[in-house]
Interface confidence: low
């Protein structure tokens, strides 16, 4: 068996740090056997078998010119092996951040804080931290650790599924390369990192007969759980074309009737979502949807929903029948919602 410990990385490659002494190990001989060392492609002997260093080659203060392939051979000239030297640096603590698009799962991403120049991998795990008692500031021993499964496609991301909203988690991301390992610990509370995805399916429709009204409707983001214990609240912004400033309202449900639109002008509308108890932050804005208030009077045919007015709107009178209020139903998939046991 080889006298050389195999560092993590491609086989046949050994590693060192610039400016430091580097030892290369001849893989195909017995430990302590005297060998000769050559630089691949160059006949000059780097170190003879009488060096007293056995199967190792010592390069003092290695620099980039020492990188490359080396050949070691036994006393009788047989090839002991080829070794490629690659120089780089030990890992530094990675930069880690976590985010959640719903209240049951969160993901963490990382990036190196310094480039090591060496093959690098990351070990990712997490522990759940629980408080012992209501008044106690002490924490029980952490439960776990459990692996934080990494994206299979090699993206620097891992996902914790089935997280508990009220728990705190300690994320461990360890950068590993052949010269060592370095760990970053990050304490994460789902409440603080929650940022829903933007609402989906935003539609903006005119309200026939009401030249200053627009009806906007949308749905929950697909990433929000189908049977949510936590609802979302919404923020809607709208503005006429060419107007720089947005008007903002906080709708009560999944639609909103804008009553102060500018007649005849297209309007941009966008919506954002947030946990209804203000955990985390607002989502990014949805893609803008556009709509233009209706013009003209209502036709005399049987009125469709939302077309109940028989005269065009200027300023609605107090007793004029308004279109139905937007539904307060928080989620289209909650019609038969029962808490699971």
């Amino acid at each position: 068996s080889s006298p050389c410990p195999q560092a993590w990385g491609p086989p046949g490659v050994q590693y060192g740090q610039p400016g430091r002494s580097v030892k290369l190990c001849c893989p195909g001989v017995t430990a302590g056997d005297p060998v000769s060392w050559f630089r691949d492609g160059e006949p000059k002997l780097l170190q003879g078998p009488d060096s007293g260093l056995g199967h190792e080659l010592v390069l003092a203060q290695a620099d980039s010119t020492d990188e490359g392939t080396y050949i070691c051979q036994t006393l009788d000239g047989a090839l002991g092996g080829t070794v490629t030297l690659q120089l780089g640096y030990p890992p530094a603590r990675p930069v880690v951040s976590c985010q959640a698009a719903d209240y049951e799962n969160f993901s963490c991403t990382w990036s190196p804080s310094q480039i090591s120049g060496l093959p690098t991998r990351y070990l990712t795990s997490y522990r759940k931290k629980t408080v012992l008692g209501a008044d106690s500031q002490r924490r029980s021993p952490s439960t776990g650790p459990w692996p934080c499964p990494q994206d299979p496609l090699g993206a620097a991301r891992c996902v914790v599924h089935g997280a508990e909203f009220w728990s705190q988690y300690r994320i461990n991301v360890t950068e590993v390369n052949p010269l060592g390992a370095s760990t970053r610990l990050l304490d994460v509370s789902l409440q603080s990192i929650l940022r829903p995805d933007p609402p989906q399916g935003l539609r903006v429709e005119s309200v026939p007969g009401y030249p200053r009204r627009l009806r906007a409707s949308w749905t929950y983001p697909a990433s929000w759980p189908c049977q949510p214990h936590f609802l979302l609240k919404f923020r809607l912004q709208y503005r006429p074309a060419q107007h720089p400033a947005w008007s903002t309202v906080e709708p009560a449900g999944l639609e909103e009737v804008i009553t102060d639109a500018v007649a005849g002008l297209p309007h941009a509308v966008r919506v954002s979502a947030r946990d209804f108890l203000d955990a985390g932050t607002w989502s990014t804005w949805s893609p803008e949807a556009w709509g233009t208030p209706s013009t003209g009077t209502i036709p005399k045919e049987i009125p469709a929903w939302g077309q109940l007015h028989t005269q065009p709107e200027v300023e609605p009178q107090v007793d004029s029948p308004a279109p139905p209020r937007p539904s307060l139903q928080p989620h289209p998939r909650l019609l038969d919602h029962r808490d699971s046991v």
């Epitope: 492609g41 090839l79 080829t82």
Partner: antibody
Framework: QVQLVQSGAEVKKPGASVKVSCKAS????????MHWLRQRPGQGLEWIGN????????HYNQKFKDRVTMTVDKSTSTAYMELSSLRSEDTAVYYC??????????WGQGTLVTVSS | DIVLTQSPATLSLSPGERATLSCRAS??????LHWYQQKSGQAPRLLIK???QSISGIPARFSGSGSGTDFTLTISSLETEDFAVYFC?????????FGQGTKLEIK
């Protein structure tokens, strides 16, 4: 000393195939990549591809990808390059070259392949 | 593919003079550039690797410099046996490509 000895000159008709061999000696065959290159009359050098003799992993120049096959016979320390669907523009001296992954340190003497109807 | 352009195409100098050959890459290739010498009827010979690293057995009068897109091969004092064709080669991306060559001839 390192030696790469290539097969002799070939004359082929358009549409035919040619297989050039390169017998290596003087070093451990399975420790080095073998590259194939060509040089058309009075022209520059063109890299065709390479093969790792220990694992036979290849990298081909896309220009030749559909027409070239590189193989090795470790038992005889010989590398082979076959080029199919020959055309007159393939008339060239073909070289094998021992090197690392991307460099060409030792070269064969070259094999002239003439494609003519 | 990365294109390497060598200049001049032909360089006429006398023995003892200094020769400067240029190679320009169509995109930045860091230092992944190598120089070869080819004498008439012979296979090429590696002179310089990775822009400036010398090769064992190559006379010290051969040196290389450059990084990014512009590279230079310098022969400090020409010997008779240096009159040949010189090629640059890049190893930044597949396929490996060569310049069209500079012919160094006796004036």
């Amino acid at each position: 000393q390192v030696q790469l000895v290539q097969s002799g000159a070939e004359v082929k008709k358009p549409g035919a195939s040619v297989k050039v061999s390169c017998k290596a000696s003087g070093y451990t065959f399975t420790n080095y990549w073998m590259h194939w290159l060509r040089q058309r009359p009075g022209q520059g050098l063109e890299w065709i591809g390479n093969i790792g003799p220990s694992d036979s992993k290849t990298h081909y120049n896309q220009k030749f990808k559909d027409r070239v096959t590189m193989t090795v016979d470790k038992s005889t320390s010989t590398a082979y390059m076959e080029l199919s669907s020959l055309r007159s523009e393939d008339t060239a001296v073909y070289y094998c070259a021992r090197g690392d992954y991307v460099l060409f340190t030792y070269w064969g003497q070259g094999t002239l392949v003439t494609v003519s109807s | 593919d990365i294109v390497l352009t060598q200049s001049p195409a032909t360089l006429s100098l006398s023995p003892g003079e200094r020769a400067t050959l240029s190679c320009r890459a169509s995109q930045s290739i860091s230092n992944n550039l190598h120089w070869y010498q080819q004498k008439s009827g012979q296979a090429p010979r590696l002179l310089i690797k990775y822009a400036s690293q010398s090769i064992s057995g190559i006379p010290a009068r051969f040196s290389g410099s450059g990084s990014g897109t512009d590279f230079t091969l310098t022969i400090s004092s020409l010997e008779t046996e240096d009159f040949a064709v010189y090629f640059c080669q890049q190893s930044y991306s597949w396929p490996l490509t060569f310049g069209q060559g500079t012919k160094l001839e006796i004036k």
